[in-house]
């Protein structure tokens, strides 16, 4: 029968006794930077070309016995997971292996850099179709390794890496922390984060998604027909590399940004038990398990968005946190979040010719996060319109006044240390959907975009009594672009998007005070692109 | 050790053609920085990736590496250029004493230097 991991990544409509996805990734080449491999294993024979690249340190130990089967174990298994005949994800993908890890699974940052350079040079000498690079390794945070990954990604290569097996924040490790890399955590057959002894999968904002990574059956280097079960974030990354190969084979023109958005979009949502993660990491960690798209074609009409969290600002009074979108993405909205509730809001600002989302800490605050909503919106022209604090009793307002521009997000930022909770909440007058409304002492920022066929609407969900969480979701066919809270008073911890749902978090109800002060409204801006839908219909 | 002695001989010969001191001082106001792995047991002191500024050409990378070797030799230190990077990042990989970091950070075109460190199969 079909192994659990292959069943898990298969969309329901394709599920059968056999794993037979529609496209096996035949147009894609997957580079594997790992240990040596047993290339004559039946699973991968003829599918993996062993390059002459080798850059590894000496093995540790007072007595070391080199045995091919042990040296090849990790790489052989991963090659099998990516493209193995029987147990592989992308059975049609061809692979090339580079040896950067020794027989004990240890390598160096410098050896990995030289390996990445080798791939870039090979790409320049002999351009082929789409390239996927699988990096099933991790070390401590490395500026240079992250920089090399960024350069390779900007050269059109898709890099997929293991989040790390340290039961720790993936942002402390490289290449997991490189924003341009697709970073994969590991889950098991019960969709729980993988535990590996005392350790386990890494987590946090640097993880893009999770994938099967426990008890994964794959090629064993003990003999040419042997199979073995292995676990780890390497195995999880290999699944995503395989899925990426299949998506790229179906749509070779996909950019890295488009591929990442599709991986996120087609993932199983909210199936991971977040209690396994440390409390402060739960909100930052994506609750996504990778899956193949239900159809390898026809996703183009969708407006794809994802949520990007910044690093924590730190606790100093003037500390700020910045969240950025990828170069091919548009920042459609910006929000902020603070566990202590002490923050001074957020604003969208230009930095190096691109909009970024900046959140501001407040005096006595433990720090803030900036949360960017990053979307794929071809031919978009977006700008930010700002209204300074109104000081009038009705609050501050700003709207999109340019012809053809629609509101995709609202942000508010205030200089005063605490927006008073005693002031009455301000609700938007009906019939003015293109308008952001906020506290009279706050400056309000509207993200206004023009793109072919883009339409947006505002959806609100208000709760009169105090509640720790208020949510509002966009309906089928619409994509959440903006998420904010009304009013922006001090008991609101912040707002953020989780998939297609806008979440507004408030302080513990016991500390909130009276009912009127506890009233909170979650405001979602939901958009869709008629232009993208029409374009995809024309293709069909 | 044998090949390192050979390298050292080559270096001494090369010294005569190298002008003394810093011909090109680093651009005013930019200070190159040093980075190392936060996890001490994973550090590999003695091997460093010298990353040069983005638009640096291969010939400049090679020249900078040679200059480092020459200036180190003048101070009695043996260095070995293990690899010159180009294609992704401009720079070079050098085996040298940590005592030379201050000197290396002052070289022209240097953006930052990172001490090598271990990575592991996951």
């Amino acid at each position: 029968s079909i192994p659990w991991n292959l069943e898990r990544i298969t969309p329901p409509r394709y599920r059968a006794d056999e794993y037979q996805p529609p496209d096996g990734g035949s147009l894609v080449e997957v580079y594997l930077l790992d240990t040596s491999i047993q290339s004559d294993h039946r699973e991968i024979e003829g599918r993996v070309m062993v390059t002459d690249f080798e850059n590894v340190p000496e093995e540790d130990g007072t007595r070391f016995h080199r045995q091919a089967s042990k040296c090849d174990s990790h790489g052989t298994h991963l090659a099998g997971v990516v493209s193995g005949r029987d147990a592989g994800v992308a059975k049609g993908a061809s692979m090339r292996s580079l040896r950067v890890l020794n027989c004990q699974g240890k390598g160096t940052v410098s050896g990995t850099l030289i390996g990445l350079e080798f791939i870039r040079k090979s790409q320049l000498v002999q351009p082929v179709g789409p390239l996927v690079v699988l990096l099933p390794l991790a070390g401590g945070y490395s500026r240079v390794l992250n920089a090399a990954c960024q350069r390779l990604a900007r050269a059109g290569v898709v890099l997929v890496t293991a989040a790390g097996n340290f039961r720790d924040d993936a942002c402390l490790y490289s290449p997991a922390s490189a924003p341009e890399v697709i970073t994969v955590g590991a889950t098991n057959a019960q969709d729980q984060p993988v535990t590996l002894g005392t350790l386990g999968t890494n987590f946090g904002r640097c993880v893009d998604l999770f994938a099967p990574g426990e008890d994964i059956i794959g090629a064993s280097s003990h003999c040419s027909t042997c199979f073995v079960s292995q676990s780890g974030t390497s195995q999880a990354a290999a699944h995503v590399a395989g899925i990426a190969a299949m998506m790229l084979s179906a749509e070779p023109e996909l950019t890295l940004a488009e591929l990442r958005q599709r991986l996120i979009h087609f993932s199983a949502k909210d199936v991971i038990n977040e209690a396994w993660f440390p409390e402060d990491q739960r909100v930052l960690t994506p609750n996504l398990v990778a899956a193949l798209p239900p159809s390898t074609h026809g996703a183009g009409w969708q407006l794809f968005c994802r949520t990007v969290w910044s690093a924590h600002s730190g606790p100093t009074r003037m500390a700020t946190a910045v969240a950025r979108c990828a170069p091919d993405e548009e920042l459609l909205s910006c929000s902020s979040f603070s566990r202590s509730g002490k923050r001074r809001g957020e604003r969208m600002e230009a930095q190096g010719g691109k909009l970024v989302c900046r959140a501001h800490n407040a005096f006595g605050g433990e720090g803030v996060y900036a949360i960017a909503r990053c979307c794929l919106l071809p031919q978009a022209n977006c700008s930010v319109h700002t209204a300074p604090p109104a000081e009038a009793s009705m609050g501050t307002r700003v709207h999109c006044h340019q012809q053809g521009h629609v509101l995709t997000g609202c942000s508010s930022h205030w200089e005063v240390e605490d927006l008073g909770t005693h002031k009455p909440p301000v609700l938007r007058p009906r019939g003015q959907p293109n308008q952001c409304v906020g506290h009279r002492e706050a400056s309000i920022h509207a993200s206004c975009c023009h793109a072919p066929g883009l339409e947006c609407k505002v959806k609100e969900h208000g709760i009169p009594a105090p509640q720790e969480q208020v949510t509002v979701a966009c309906e089928e066919g619409w994509t959440l672009t903006g998420c904010s809270a009304l009013p922006g008073t001090s008991h609101v911890l912040g707002a953020y998007a989780v998939d297609n749902t806008c979440v507004v978090r408030s302080r513990d109800v016991s500390t909130t005070g009276s009912t009127s002060e506890g009233a909170v409204t979650a405001v979602a801006i939901c958009c869709r692109s008629r232009h993208l839908a029409q374009a995809s219909q024309e293709l069909q | 050790q044998e090949d390192e002695d050979g390298d050292y001989e080559e270096l001494v010969l090369a010294l005569r053609s190298e002008e003394d001191g810093l011909a090109e001082a680093p651009e005013h106001g930019t200070t190159a920085t040093f980075h190392r792995c936060a996890k001490d047991p994973w550090r590999l002191p003695g091997t460093y990736v010298v990353v040069l500024k983005e638009e640096t050409h291969l010939s400049q990378s090679e020249r900078t590496a040679r200059r480092l070797q020459a200036q180190a030799a003048r101070r009695g230190y043996l260095t070995k250029i293990l690899h010159v990077f180009h294609g992704l990042l401009p720079g070079f990989l050098v085996k040298m004493s940590g005592d030379l970091l201050e000197l290396a950070l002052k070289l022209p075109h240097v953006d930052y230097i990172e001490e090598d460190s271990s990575v592991f199969a996951q």
């Epitope: 093995e59 540790d60 016995h65 350790l199 | 550090r43």
Partner: antibody, heavy 122, light 111 residues
Framework: QVQLVQSGAEVKKPGSSVKVSCKAS????????MHWVRQAPGQGLEWMGL????????YYADSAKGRFTISRDNSKNTLYLQMNSLRSDDTAVYYC???????????????WGQGTTVTVSS | QSALTQPPSVSGSPGQSVTISCTGT????????VSWYQQLPGTAPKLMIY???KRPSGVPDRFSGSKSGNTASLTISGLQTGDEADYYC???????????FGTGTRVTVLG
């Protein structure tokens, strides 16, 4: 649950040999390195040695080199400590302990056996 | 194998904090991860802290570790009678190519 179960107590004469075993259950034994640690009566912990997960590499304490050998049978999920030329100062409780992770964390011990008392006396 | 240096004993009243130091050299604590183990009377040691300051799941957050230079420390806050035990630090030693334990510290809860 995850556990290491060790063989029973041994009483041996000086100069003789003994082989202590440690059977693992509820975890993937061949994914973890394994240590031996001993504790003489009323004394502290003394590390004896470490064997890689696949048996390919090993380290020994000076006091164990030449006389003690660590081995493992991954098909039986069992670790062994062979002690030869026993002396009275080898009298101790011997613990097997699991290395915490792969090579990057081999040196922390997160699961311990219950201990095997070895008494060497004439 | 020369051991790391710990104080033979420390004591404190219930609810108080106690700190145990562990001094080594640059070849062990200075440049390697430090672990801390608790050994209750008559039982096998138990891992309490790894990589200087990380706790395995199930270890209360009353136990915390830190490192400065060649010295590591274990702090037990909100001391409880159940914390009475021997505590050992441990670290790899790169010059010995072996693991070294501390001399051990007995923690006594007064009263």
């Amino acid at each position: 649950q995850v556990q290491l179960v060790q063989s029973g107590a041994e009483v041996k004469k000086p100069g003789s040999s003994v082989k202590v075993s440690c059977k693992a259950s509820a975890f993937t034994f061949d994914s973890f390195g394994m240590h031996w640690v001993r504790q003489a009566p009323g004394q502290g912990l003394e590390w004896m040695g470490l064997l890689w997960s696949d048996g390919s590499g090993e380290y020994y304490a000076d006091s164990a080199k030449g006389r003690f050998t660590i081995s493992r049978d991954n098909s039986k999920n069992t670790l062994y400590l062979q002690m030869n030329s026993l002396r009275s100062d080898d009298t101790a409780v011997y613990y097997c302990a699991r290395a915490m992770g792969a090579i990057y964390y081999y040196y922390a011990m997160d699961v311990w056996g219950q201990g095997t008392t070895v008494t060497v006396s004439s | 194998q020369s051991a790391l240096t710990q104080p033979p004993s420390v004591s404190g009243s219930p609810g108080q904090s106690v700190t145990i130091s562990c001094t080594g050299t640059s070849s062990n604590i200075g440049n390697q991860f430090v672990s801390w183990y608790q050994q209750l009377p008559g039982t096998a040691p138990k891992l309490m802290i790894y990589e200087y300051n990380k706790r395995p799941s199930g270890v209360p957050d009353r136990f915390s570790g830190s490192k400065s230079g060649n010295t590591a420390s274990l702090t037990i806050s909100g001391l409880q009678t159940g914390d009475e035990a021997d505590y050992y630090c441990g670290s790899w030693d790169s010059s010995l190519s072996g693991y070294v334990f501390g001399t051990g510290t007995r923690v006594t809860v007064l009263g």
